[in-house]
Every structure is written in C-alpha cells, then in structure tokens.
C-alpha cells in the first residue's frame, strides 16, 4: 500500500489521543532506555509503511500485536484516512489462528513496540533532519 | 463464523436524519474496533467512522464530522451509526466492518443502502 494520499495530520491526532496512550500502557514497567531503536523511517509514507509492517507482520518471537488495542486503532485511523488502505489484506492469518487464548507478552513483543514507539514519534515529526 | 448484520437504511429526504445499526454475532464485539464504510456508486469504499468497543475512542471521516455519530452498546453487540443532516453525497451503500478475531483483516456486513434524495 502507498501510504502518500493519507491524511497525516488526521493520524498525528488519532495518535497523540489515543495511539500514544495505548502504546505506553503496553510498555509499563519497561524503562524507557531498556531497548536501542534500530528501524528509522525518512518521511510520513516511509514512517507509516514502516509502521504497518511491525504492527501487523508477525515477526520471529512475537506474532501477537495484531489484537492490541494500539494495532486496532492504528488500523482504524488508517482505514478512516488513507483511501482505499480497507481494501488492503494483512497477511497475519496464520499467526492469528495460533496466537494462544492467555495474553502473554514477550520481551520481543516490548521490543517491536519500542521500535513502534519511536517510528510514530518520527512520523509526528516529518520536518526533523535524520540523525 | 462471526457474521455483521447491518440494518436501518432507506431513502430519506435531505437534511433528514437515519440510524444504521449493525448487530455482531459470536464473541468479536469484545474489546475490539467496530467502523463504518461507505461505498457511492462508481466509487472506492471510503471509512466513514469507528469506534473502539475498548474504551469508546472514535474516528470520523472530514466529510462526516458533527453530522454523524457513532456509538456501541457492548451488552446488544451493536454498533450504530447516528446519521443527520444528510446529503445528497452521502448516498451509498453502508458497510459495518469489525477486526478479525482469525485474521488481521475486516469481517465485512452485507451492506445497507441509504438514499439522500427529494
């Protein structure tokens, strides 16, 4: 999906209400200098095509962001505004089906949302030069 | 299987008011996003509004905002779309749409039309 046609600003406030907060309660008890941030976005599209993939990718050691509420939501403000991002299918199927019914939470999975954390500050700010 | 049944819609005059309602069978109404979507004819499918069933966090299209309202009673498994001062653009089919509890794709209604016109 080419993410440029969304409305960022719309997703920038979608995030800063309720996205952020989701996000921060998943890292609770995780110091915030526990993990390095490794993926890096250049721009608003980059940053949300980068954000998509950790979000809903299923990744070695953590295959279950998919049904977080900040994975939903995310979902949903992308749905809302970037055109035709509904029609898109998200290859989480698998590791849906075998996802366990206990919550169980990974230090991969606090890692991934780490990295998401810092994608989403640098989508909420596109006019920052990359280090 | 989860199935979305969607209801509520009609023809109705401009500036009049209808309420779409969309009833969730099996347990995917629980913490989850519930959305609306629209599709004109000959035109893409485009979000209207959700809302998380989590904590009442809602989302709403520009072209939508304060006329319509969206809400969800998790005791009914319902979601329902408030819709007024409607207009003509806004005629289209309406879809209800809800997060997978198998995949990470939408669980789609069958659609409901609604008709703006004089």
């Known amino acids: 999906y080419d993410f440029t046609n969304c409305d960022f600003e719309k997703i920038k406030a979608a995030y800063l209400s309720t996205i952020s907060k989701d996000l921060i309660t998943y890292m609770s008890g995780t110091k915030s200098t526990e993990f390095n941030n490794t993926v890096s976005c250049s721009n608003r599209p980059h940053c949300l095509t980068e954000i998509q993939s950790l979000t809903f990718n299923p990744t070695a050691g953590c295959a279950s962001l998919a049904k977080e509420m900040f994975a939903m939501k995310t979902k949903a403000a992308l749905a809302i505004w970037c055109p035709g991002y509904s029609e898109t299918q998200i290859n989480a199927t698998q590791a849906m089906k075998k996802r366990r019914k206990r919550k169980v939470t990974t230090n991969k999975c606090l890692e991934q949302v780490s990295q998401l954390q810092g994608l989403w500050r640098r989508f909420n700010r596109p006019l920052l030069k990359q280090q | 299987e989860v199935q979305l049944v969607e209801s509520g819609g009609g023809l109705v005059q401009p500036g009049g008011s209808l309420r779409l309602s969309c009833a969730a069978s099996?347990?995917?109404?629980?913490?989850?996003?519930m959305c609306w979507f629209r599709q004109a004819p000959g035109k893409e499918r485009e979000g209207v509004s959700c809302?998380?069933?989590?904590?009442?966090?809602?989302y709403y299209a520009d072209s939508v905002k304060g006329r319509f309202t969206i809400s969800a009673d998790n005791s009914k498994n319902t979601a329902y779309l408030q819709m007024n001062s409607l207009k003509p653009e806004d005629t289209a089919v309406y879809y209800c749409?809800?997060?997978?509890?198998?995949?990470?794709?939408?669980?789609w209604g069958q659609g409901t039309l609604v008709t703006v016109s004089s």
């Open positions: 749409a809800a997060d997978s509890e198998t995949s990470g794709n939408w669980v």
């Open positions: 099996g347990n995917i109404f629980t913490r989850n996003i």
């Open positions: 809302i998380s069933t989590g904590d009442g966090s809602t």
